[in-house]
């Protein structure tokens, strides 16, 4: 039998007590095979966190920065469920520190030294710990100790609960420092207080500080949020310009073996009996003898942390890299304005060879990071563990949704002035042999299809979210008889014709070698009836152009293409006969590395791009013998995109709409991950 | 298409060196980047030396200052020299010209290199 005990963690008597009332209460109401609680009582958070990593307790909630020590090694622990506040209609799980600003003081993020600053607290969160941990390495050296670089770099502060004494410049605007709400300026509306009342030039405060404080929007319009990309915007605008998303309280897990599904369906059950006005008795969320007992006494609310969540992606990039600055204290040598490499993320082992081939001969410029899936790389884009790669609009869509954004577009299209001129697009077909000359659009189901891979655009978001608008449901795999969709599940009948072998069967990468444009091509040659890919790739497979053994003899007019009115037509004519003009594909990055990705792949396209004629013997950034790694093959340069440097803008509302409506059918776990922190 | 052959691997002890070779059948003057990889038990093949025509050289991070790549275009051939080994070095080293068979897996034999005591 399972044992179905979750062990949860308690650091004070008044917390046991709770814990023993929690574990009464929940046997009360709960089937004698459902979940039981046992509490553990240990004397602090860490000492919880360690009996975890143990195995000798199970759970316990944290505070954001203990959410990140509970990920250091050895710990490894991981989020499995979030407190929510507000209502159950708009949870809130995160909240967002930010710096605010008067509307007419005109200095950005990185023109703050001298200026005057407003603190809620020495250590806490918004106020202090995430605003000094990301402007770290900008503080003068020494950098320890801390609050005397911190009154170094600032002209004058208020920092309540700092040592008026030994930093007196932290305490120079409001006298004393005093860690109470006898400081006026103490706490959220206290800092906000120091900058309106003009003591300060600049308050650390959260997101919902401003609202709380200015019931008037004439009021808040006076003003404004500093982003970390040095520009300003409206207090409202919190989401896109903040210095950090934090989540708020969350239970920690082991990430191997932590019965995760066991402590939702826990705490599920127990927000359902004892959640916000379910009972007299026992109220999961009220603190009778104390505050905040095993959960916050404001929770509203748990929701289920996604699986593909771990702590780094669940606290953000800019969160994760104050706390560390702050913690270990290493800045580069010194700062300077030279471009640090960019970190590549290659997919899987054809793509890392391109890669380092690209990094020798980018003399340190272009360094390789590897992962198995297009979602892995994303998830190290948005780490830090790399910084860029380019992806089809299916994956700038997703990676958009993780915050991150485009900024170079790749171009198939020779013009004098390619680098300016970013395309509208290319266009999804779906192609079948001449010879199976009763296929039409109208009579797909039970024919077998071929796809680049699941989530791409061409192959999967465009065919399928017609298809979807046709059949009302998700289940494409009982649609076609079979076939090769990489990304599928392995044991879907859309992996049936895929070709990898063992664990690389299906697999998103070019391990698969259906995998792709040319793959799915491939796919069609070989097995399918019907493949879903760009215009150009008949061409650029037929003719002698591709010479793998599969494709040499092939003979472009052996295929058609399917129009969406019935019919069908050559291949040249896919301009009449074609699905959808789909996004180029374009490359992705954070928005703190946007400037210097673009400055690296500008250079590299000038040294390796087309303009390179012989590239038997020197390296093509663009080549890779019709097998599309890194880049597509038939790049002929990376174009700027002025203003569409959002996914939403450079998608297009038309394909952010498609996709969207395809949401209900993904199987991404990290969209799913992504949409949690922004829904 | 040149085709390359990997030798001078062996049974070494910690601490001590060896040279590798890689011996091309035709002009590697035209070729412009070389690199060794190597596949130690049960991992996937990783990048430890790469150097271009013009050589500029890279090293994955385990192996700076200890390994050294170069090549001698007039003799067709280039090198590994790895000094203060590891055991965890034990691996088949191969060779690379980066041309498209790497891109089908078309590997050669590679050479073993085993650093025990």
């Known amino acids: 039998v399972p044992d179905k005990t979750v062990r949860w963690c308690a650091v004070s008597e008044h917390e046991a007590t709770k814990c023993q009332s929690f574990r009464d209460h929940m046997k009360s109401v709960i089937p004698s095979d459902g979940p039981s609680v046992a509490c553990v009582k240990k004397a602090s958070y860490l000492d919880c966190i360690r009996a975890i990593a143990a195995n000798e307790a199970d759970a316990v909630t944290l505070d954001a920065g203990l959410v990140y020590d509970a990920y250091l090694a050895p710990n490894n622990l991981k989020p499995v469920v979030a407190e929510f506040y507000g209502s159950k209609e708009d949870p809130q799980t995160f909240y967002y520190a930010v710096a605010v600003v008067k509307k007419d003081s005109g200095f950005q993020m990185n023109q703050l030294r001298g200026k005057k600053s407003c603190h809620t607290g020495l250590g806490r969160s918004a106020g202090w710990n995430i605003p000094i941990g990301l402007l770290y390495c900008d503080l003068p050296e020494p950098r320890k100790p801390l609050e005397k670089a911190v009154a170094n770099f600032f002209s004058g502060s208020c920092a309540p609960c700092a040592d008026g004494t030994d930093f007196p410049q932290l305490c120079q605007l409001c006298p004393g420092c005093g860690c109470s709400t006898l400081n006026q300026y103490f706490g959220y509306s206290g800092a906000f207080k120091c900058l309106k009342d003009g003591a300060g030039d600049v308050a650390f405060v959260k997101h919902s500080t401003i609202f709380e404080n200015l019931a008037n929007k004439a009021d808040r319009d006076q003003y404004e949020l500093l982003c970390l990309d040095n520009t300003r915007k409206p207090v409202d605008e919190y989401k896109d310009c903040h210095l950090a998303q934090v989540p708020s309280h969350t239970v920690v897990a082991r990430s191997m073996g932590g019965k995760e599904d066991l402590i939702w369906e826990l705490l599920n059950q127990a927000q359902e009996h004892f959640g916000k006005d379910k009972s007299k008795e026992f109220q999961l969320f009220s603190s009778p003898h104390g505050k905040d007992l095993l959960f916050k006494d404001s929770a509203h609310g748990f929701l289920k942390v996604p699986p593909r969540m771990d702590a780094k992606m669940y606290l953000g990039y800019e969160y994760v890299t104050a706390i560390r600055n702050l913690r270990e204290g290493t800045c580069p040598e010194a700062p300077t304005d030279e471009c640090k490499p960019v970190k590549w993320c290659a997919l899987s082992h054809h793509e890392r060879l391109k890669c380092d081939e690209w990094s020798v001969n980018s003399v340190g410029k272009i360094e390789c990071v590897s992962a198995e899936t297009t979602e892995d790389c994303i998830a190290k884009i948005m780490n830090g563990e790399a910084d860029a790669m380019s992806l089809d609009g299916g994956f700038v869509y997703i990676a958009g949704k993780c915050g991150l954004v485009p900024v170079l577009a790749e171009n198939y299209n020779k013009s004098d002035n390619c680098e300016d001129t970013p395309e509208a697009g290319y266009f999804a077909i779906a192609v079948v042999k001449k010879s199976a000359s009763d296929l039409t659009w109208d009579n797909l189901k039970g024919k077998k299809s071929c796809h680049t891979a699941v989530g791409r655009t061409a192959g999967w978001n465009i065919p399928m979210g017609l298809l979807y608008n046709k059949i009302n449901h998700c289940r494409f795999d009982e649609f076609f008889s079979e076939g090769c969709a990489p990304g599928s599940k392995k044991d879907s009948s859309l992996c049936k014709l895929c070709m990898g072998s063992g664990l690389n069967l299906c697999e998103p990468n070019n391990k698969e070698g259906y995998y792709g444009y040319t793959g799915a091509f491939r796919c069609l040659v070989e097995k399918g009836d019907v493949a879903f890919v760009k215009h150009q790739t008949v061409p650029q497979n037929t003719g002698g152009k591709n010479p793998d053994p599969w494709a040499k003899n092939l003979n472009e007019k052996d295929y058609e293409l399917l129009c969406l009115d019935g019919t069908r037509k050559p291949v040249e004519e896919y301009a009449n006969c074609h699905l959808a003009r789909a996004p180029n594909h374009a490359v992705v990055t954070r928005k703190d590395k946007e400037a210097c990705v673009h400055k690296i792949l500008r250079q590299q396209q000038h040294l390796f791009g087309s303009n390179v004629t012989d590239c038997s013997g020197n390296f093509c950034l663009f080549r890779s013998e019709t097998k599309d790694l890194l880049f597509r093959d038939d790049t002929v340069c990376l174009a700027k995109l002025h203003d569409r440097n959002t996914y939403e803008k450079y998608l297009g509302e038309e394909y952010v709409k498609a996709v969207g409506n395809l949401r209900k059918c993904s199987t991404s776990s990290l969209l799913e991950a992504c949409t949690f922190r922004r829904p | 298409q040149v085709q390359l052959v990997e030798s001078g691997g062996g049974l070494v002890q910690p601490g001590g060196s060896l040279r590798l070779s890689c011996a091309a059948s035709g002009s590697i003057f035209s070729i412009n980047t070389m690199g060794w990889y190597r596949q130690r038990p049960g991992k996937q093949r990783e990048l430890v030396a790469a150097?271009?025509?013009?050589?500029?050289?890279n090293y994955a991070d385990s192996v700076k200052g200890r390994f050294s790549i170069s090549r001698d275009n007039a003799k067709n051939t280039m090198y590994l020299q790895m000094n203060s080994l590891k055991p965890e070095d034990t691996a088949v080293y191969y060779c690379t010209d980066y041309s498209r068979r790497y891109y089908q897996d078309d590997w050669g034999q590679g050479t073993q290199v085993t650093v025990s005591s």
């Open positions: 150097i271009t025509r013009g050589g500029n050289t």
